[in-house]
């Protein structure tokens, strides 16, 4: 029950997160005009990843798309790429996680397969969230750098009567939406990974293949190769043998891929 709840909650949190990442990517307010020096401007500028806009006091808003690809800053291109990768991974993750939900039965899908899918979607959500957080952070860093550069320019060369005030930009709403959305997607992904552990059959429940010897039964357990840390006395890989009878059912069952994770 707890596993289902964790998986379901992870899915919902990731869904909200990915919706937020999509919203942030589409939003125009990634950077907004800094009004510190001019709080009563009749012209308000703001910019997104895809276009820049100007809202006038008259109520008229004019937006212009960035119709060039080569002329755009490399950082902006990188942010675009990160956000798109985040959305694509998130969307695939959502698709996979729908089929992985424990509450949804699709044919005779085993828990091991659902566990695999849950883990896959969880990893996708984590990467998606990290892409969004990275994208937003790169853009924020770009803004901070430009802000201080333009501030330095504002206070130089103003010896004359005429002032040319450079437009400075600060953090827009999309940045905060992106950070929160990326965080939610990341949390959702972690929850999916936790749920995956609960969905997977325990080590004690692992099915073993029986080999019937003439003298006594010897079962070879897959997963018998233990990865050594190199710190203990067990520095060599040891095959673990376990004698005893096995049922016919066990003879036919094979270890799943998940047993090797």
């Amino acid at each position: 029950m707890a596993v289902t709840a964790c998986q379901g909650l992870g899915f919902v949190v990731s869904l909200i997160g990915i919706a937020g990442i999509i919203a942030a990517t589409c939003m125009d307010q990634w950077s907004t005009q800094d009004l510190y020096n001019n709080p009563v401007t009749a012209v308000f500028n703001y910019q997104g990843l895809w276009r820049s806009c100007v809202r006038e006091s008259s109520g008229f808003t004019e937006c212009r798309g960035y119709f060039t690809l080569l002329g755009l800053p490399a950082m902006l291109q990188a942010v675009r790429a990160l956000m798109i990768v985040g959305i694509v991974l998130g969307a695939i993750g959502l698709l996979v996680s729908i089929f992985a939900l424990k509450c949804i039965r699709i044919g005779s899908m085993e828990d091991s397969a659902k566990a695999n899918m849950t883990l896959t979607s969880g990893i996708m959500f984590i990467v998606s969230g990290l892409c969004a957080i990275a994208g937003v952070s790169v853009f924020a860093n770009m803004l901070v750098t430009n802000f201080w550069m333009s501030t330095a320019n504002m206070y130089t060369g103003m010896g004359g009567m005429v002032q040319t005030v450079q437009t400075r930009y600060t953090f827009g709403a999309a940045l905060f939406v992106g950070w929160v959305a990326g965080g939610l997607t990341l949390i959702g992904g972690v929850m999916m990974c936790i749920a995956c552990r609960g969905l997977a059959p325990e080590e004690t429940n692992y099915k073993a293949v029986s080999y019937h010897a003439s003298g006594h039964s010897v079962a070879y357990k897959p997963g018998g190769f233990k990865a050594s840390t190199g710190f203990g006395s067990n520095t060599k890989n040891k095959k673990i043998y376990d004698g005893g009878a096995r049922t016919e059912d066990e003879v036919q069952s094979y270890p799943s891929k998940h047993d090797y994770v």
């Epitope: 009563v40 012209v43 500028n45 008259s58 109520g59």
Partner: antibody, heavy 120, light 113 residues
């Protein structure tokens, strides 16, 4: 045809109050940002106040801030300017003007004006 | 506040001649966001309210004769009447539309020589 008709002007003593009205017609009033502009006896034009279409944002000339209040009733297609604590320097011809939607914040239509004389 | 300085205060030009009015702002009226200048020109005839002639520094308002031309960038702007007509006798004002307060120039009185 766009029409702006101001009313409410008159003679008032310093410290007195007055409320100007501007009846608008011929356009979708609620869509437009509206302003009050005054013309002094020396013929200088002075912007007084602006209110955006929805009424959410208002802007004032520093010398009238706290004394004048711009408001609008979109249901009645009317713009108002409540003037309190009037001073002699507020004597002017007050115009109601519409800010054009695509005119880069320029005032594309003006009323005929209403005269306010602040005198003791 | 942005100070708008108009020159000359008055101007006498012969009919059919070119009239040029200048306007200088204390701060740039250019907006980098849309590459536009936020300056307007108005014409006021005696006993009438001001009439919008030019907005965005160079765009003629509909119905305004093409003899009226606006130009300039940033802080320096010009209104040119290519061939003065008798009906052009008026006071001309420039206005900052970029920053509140939306300040006006003191006006230039145009007369016929």
């Amino acid at each position: 045809e766009v029409m702006l008709v101001e009313s409410g002007g008159g003679v008032v003593q310093p410290g007195g109050s007055l409320r100007l009205s501007c009846a608008a017609s011929g356009f979708t009033f609620s869509t437009y940002t509206m302003s009050w502009v005054r013309q002094t006896p020396e013929k200088r034009l002075e912007w007084v106040a602006t209110i955006v279409g929805g009424g959410g944002y208002t802007y004032y000339l520093d010398s009238v801030k706290g004394r004048f209040t711009i408001s609008r009733d979109n249901a009645k297609n009317t713009l108002y300017l409540q003037m309190n604590s009037l001073r002699t320097e507020d004597t002017a011809l007050y115009y109601c003007a519409r800010m054009g939607l695509t005119q880069r914040n320029a005032l594309d239509y003006w009323g005929q004006g209403t005269l306010i004389t602040v005198s003791s | 506040d942005i100070v708008m300085t108009q020159s000359p205060d008055s101007l006498a030009v012969s009919l059919g001649e070119r009239a040029t009015i200048n306007c200088k702002s204390s701060q740039s009226l250019f907006n980098s966001g849309n590459q536009k200048n936020y300056l307007a020109w108005y014409q006021q005839k005696p006993g009438q309210p001001p009439k919008l002639l030019i907005y965005g520094a160079s765009t003629r308002e509909s119905g305004v004769p093409d003899r009226f031309t606006g130009s300039g960038f940033g802080t320096d702007f010009t209104l040119t009447i290519s061939s003065l007509q008798a009906e052009d006798v008026a006071v001309y004002y420039c206005q900052n539309d970029h920053t509140y307060p939306l300040t006006f120039g003191a006006g230039t009185k145009l007369e016929i020589k």
